[in-house]
């Protein structure tokens, strides 16, 4: 995984760190999975499981891998070219307006409403008024009459942090 190369032509403080694989930048940029050295002469590989870069870049630091929070499951691990993919656990979801935490899905709809959408990792159950068919949004008052729902299947990531 590592390639030791000598760089006698470089200023002494810019020589290669032996534990990291290096290549040369192309037009001042380094490929995904790398960052640029501070003298601009080398592309240094990110550390698997610790940091990453997704695009051609001139980053001085690779980006830190996201750690999934409790209440989240890791769909795919962090690689040198892709951040960790985290998803809310079954029965919970993450809203766009509160992306920092997974919230519990409602167990059913209020009286006079019917469920038309299941709980998914990225959305709560969806309720509509029986007659009008208009969606219900916002906090639910005390549920008097509920229609039970099974948690949605975690099919795809609800957030790609990073």
């Amino acid at each position: 995984e590592s390639a030791l190369i000598t760089q006698q032509d470089l200023a002494p403080q810019q020589r290669a760190a032996p534990q990291q694989k290096r290549s040369s930048p192309s037009e001042g940029l380094c490929p995904p999975g790398h960052h640029i050295s501070e003298d601009g002469r080398d592309c240094i590989s990110c550390k698997y499981g610790q940091d990453y870069s997704t695009h051609w870049n001139d980053l001085l630091f690779c980006l830190r891998c996201t750690r999934c929070d409790s209440g989240e499951v890791e769909l795919s691990p962090c690689t040198t070219t892709r951040n960790t993919v985290c998803q809310c656990e079954e029965g919970t979801f993450r809203e766009e307006d509160s992306p920092e935490m997974c919230r519990k899905c409602r167990t059913g709809c209020p009286r006079g409403m019917v469920k038309v959408g299941d709980c998914t990792p990225w959305s709560d159950i969806e309720c509509v008024h029986k007659e009008s068919g208009t969606k219900h949004s916002g906090e639910v008052p005390a549920v008097e009459e509920t229609v039970t729902s099974s948690p949605g299947t975690p099919a795809s990531p609800c957030s790609l942090s990073g």
Epitope: A11, Q14, A17, G28, D39, G40, D58, L60, F61
Partner: antibody
């Protein structure tokens, strides 16, 4: 011989702005990442900001994020630090330094920024 | 962020004596990104050691650096009058870059 020469420091009121410059010579400026490091009177060194050789990537200490902007003009071999919304705690000698992560191998003589009413 | 703690805060020694300065990191840092600087009053810092143990250009061999992981040491084998100054360690492993608070080496 590598030389870094800062300018632009001075006395400014809280909330005011100042732009520091660092003229570089003696090395291929556009290839190297550059930094600003500051030192409050009688205190230790604090890294402030860094920029990649092309200027495409910039980094800031939390204490200055959103208020300071680092930039460079490679055609003029000059590094800049635009400082806005200045506070009393920003009072320090500001050094321009060559390098970022491995080391700061060359430093300017520093320019004093005093934030006071 | 990685916090670097230097000890002792002040070291009182006589010329000719050996000085041992410590720099401890709050989490592991790469040796490739650990440097030491010397600063005298009214002057800019000067790079002494980079990569934990490599001497910068023009630095006398009485200065040496060692260590890995979280514990690093700067040793001045035999203090010269011009070595009395403040010494800082610095890490560049993770953003933000951080310095230790400094160790002052003063004449006893």
């Amino acid at each position: 011989e590598v030389q870094l020469l800062e300018s632009g420091g001075g006395l400014v009121q809280p909330g005011g702005s100042l732009r520091l410059s660092c003229a570089a010579s003696g090395f291929t400026f556009s290839s190297y990442a550059m930094s600003w490091v500051r030192q409050a009177p009688g205190k230790g060194l604090e890294w402030v900001s860094a920029i990649s050789g092309s200027g495409g990537s910039t980094y800031y200490a939390d204490s200055v994020k959103g208020r300071f902007t680092i930039s460079r003009d490679n055609s003029k071999n000059t590094l800049y630090l635009q400082m806005n919304s200045l506070r009393a705690e920003d009072t320090a000698v500001y050094y321009c330094a060559k390098g970022v992560r491995v080391s700061f191998d060359y430093w300017g003589q520093g320019t004093l920024v005093t934030v006071s009413s | 962020e990685i916090v670097l703690t230097q000890s002792p805060g002040t070291l009182s020694l006589s010329p000719g004596e050996r000085a041992t300065l410590s720099c401890r990191a709050s989490q592991s840092v790469s040796s490739s990104y650990l440097a030491w600087y010397q600063q005298k009053p009214g002057q800019a810092p000067r790079l002494l050691i980079y990569g934990a143990s490599s001497r910068a250009t023009g630095i006398p061999d009485r200065f040496s650096g060692s260590g890995s992981g979280t514990d690093f040491t700067l040793t001045i084998s035999r203090l010269e009058p011009e070595d009395f100054a403040v010494y800082y360690c610095q890490q560049g492993t993770t953003h933000p870059i951080t310095f230790g608070q400094g160790t002052k080496v003063e004449i006893k």
